[in-house]
């Protein structure tokens, strides 16, 4: 018995179906086919779980969280024992193993391994201003999304005709910050943060209004 090489890893957007491949060759009839799918969740590597089981011509549910979401892609028994997972969740991310036995065919590689990563687009980021908006001050524009896998990168841009930040600005795309030094009237305006990763984009807006000093009345 020989389980074929798997593609290594699969990426899928949260909520979308995933197909985890596992095929094998055997010299024996499929009368005694036994297939166990296991997962080692990324979130809990010490606690492997059973996903689905095929034994004695019957299918059995694995862990409760997979109930109603998992099944074999084809009619069993077959040499293609790939499974689907519907409505993928973040907690489905992990390393999946298919263990195949088909007596009396013994020997060879009877395990296939596939990684599954469930991707999450950036959630609507939160935009805020840190620091005084008085003319001549330094301000920091902050942007962060609570969710996003892979981790989002952040790009700030100014929504005026030039489509760019003022020359006194420096930005950190990883942290989602922009520091604008020595703000002036030219720094005022609408700023947009674009949070993006491999599967999505989300934005927030911030209105920076630089405050000019009020003329003081003398006497």
């Amino acid at each position: 018995l020989e389980v074929s090489e798997s593609p290594g890893s699969i990426q899928v957007a949260r909520g979308q179906p995933a197909v985890l491949p596992c095929t094998f060759t055997t010299s024996a009839a499929l009368i005694n086919l036994n297939v166990i799918w296991m997962v080692t969740p990324l979130s809990n590597a010490n606690q492997p779980e059973q996903v689905i089981l095929y034994q004695g011509g019957q299918m059995f549910d694995g862990a409760p969280r997979f109930h109603g979401r998992v099944g074999f892609t084809g009619t069993m028994p077959a040499t293609n024992v790939s499974i689907f997972i519907n409505n993928t969740q973040l907690s489905d991310t992990g390393t999946y193993q298919c263990l195949v036995n088909n007596l009396p065919d013994i020997g060879g590689r009877n395990i296939g391994v596939t990684g599954l990563t469930v991707l999450v687009p950036p959630s609507a980021p939160h935009c805020q201003i840190q620091g005084s908006q008085d003319i001549g001050s330094d301000v920091i524009l902050l942007c962060s999304s609570e969710e996003g896998i892979p981790r989002p990168t952040y790009l700030w841009e100014k929504l005026d005709n030039t489509l760019k930040l003022p020359p006194t600005a420096t930005q950190d795309q990883v942290q989602g910050t922009v520091t604008i030094r020595n703000i002036s009237a030219l720094s005022s305006g609408l700023y947009q943060c674009v949070a993006s990763n491999a599967i999505g984009t989300s934005t927030c807006l911030l209105d920076l209004q630089v405050i000019s000093p009020q003329p003081r009345n003398i006497g």
């Epitope: 700030w156 841009e157 005709n161 030039t162 489509l163 947009q192 674009v194 984009t201």
Partner: antibody, heavy 121, light 110 residues
Framework: EVQLLESGGGLVQPGGSLRLSCAAS????????MSWVRQAPGKGLEWVSA????????YYADSVKGRFTISRDNSKNTLYLQMNSLRAEDTAVYYC??????????????WGQGTMVTVSS | ASVLTQPPSVSAAPGQKVTISCSGS????????VSWYQQLPGTAPKLLIY???KRPSGIPDRFSGSKSGTSATLGITGLQAEDEADYYC???????????FGGGTKLTVL
Amino acid sequence: EVQLLESGGGLVQPGGSLRLSCAASGFTFSQTAMSWVRQAPGKGLEWVSAASYSGYSTYYADSVKGRFTISRDNSKNTLYLQMNSLRAEDTAVYYCARDSRDAYGVAFDLWGQGTMVTVSS
Amino acid sequence: ASVLTQPPSVSAAPGQKVTISCSGSSSNIGNNYVSWYQQLPGTAPKLLIYDNNKRPSGIPDRFSGSKSGTSATLGITGLQAEDEADYYCLTWTGAGRIFVFGGGTKLTVL
């Protein structure tokens, strides 16, 4: 080396399509606004389109609006111009240009060598 | 025709001074910054002036820029043969969110 390199130009029939690419190197592409500028044979410069850092915001000249689409892939440091429903008057050298981060106003401080687009039957 | 008006051509002798005007309106030059470009025959344009009057590094101080109201001016002193080229102004318009070049001026060094 800091440079912009355009490609994708050529001869196309009226009504046809072309996709221009501009490969950037030597600077932080994702933190730079980018534009396409064209020059018809013997004529002056004409700004075509601009894209913000992320490509989320885009501007177009009236002459190409609805026919051309600017986009960028920051992971590949590349700017694109998808040109559809091409007309004879779109015949020009197309330049990719970087907008200076040192300027408040629009200021193209780095240009590609240009790629020729000829629309003719 | 461009919304920014430049003289089609200007000429002067070597060593002389020349100015090139760029005339617009309140919706473009009047409320926005102007940049200037030099284009030698068969080459890509080169930035000479940005933000009305600033020079990028490497641009000699023979080149200067200014803006007054709805017009901008490029000045070139100590004219040299290699200054013979086409010159363009550029700004943007607030209304249409578009960038706009002037029609260009051909400088001939006599």
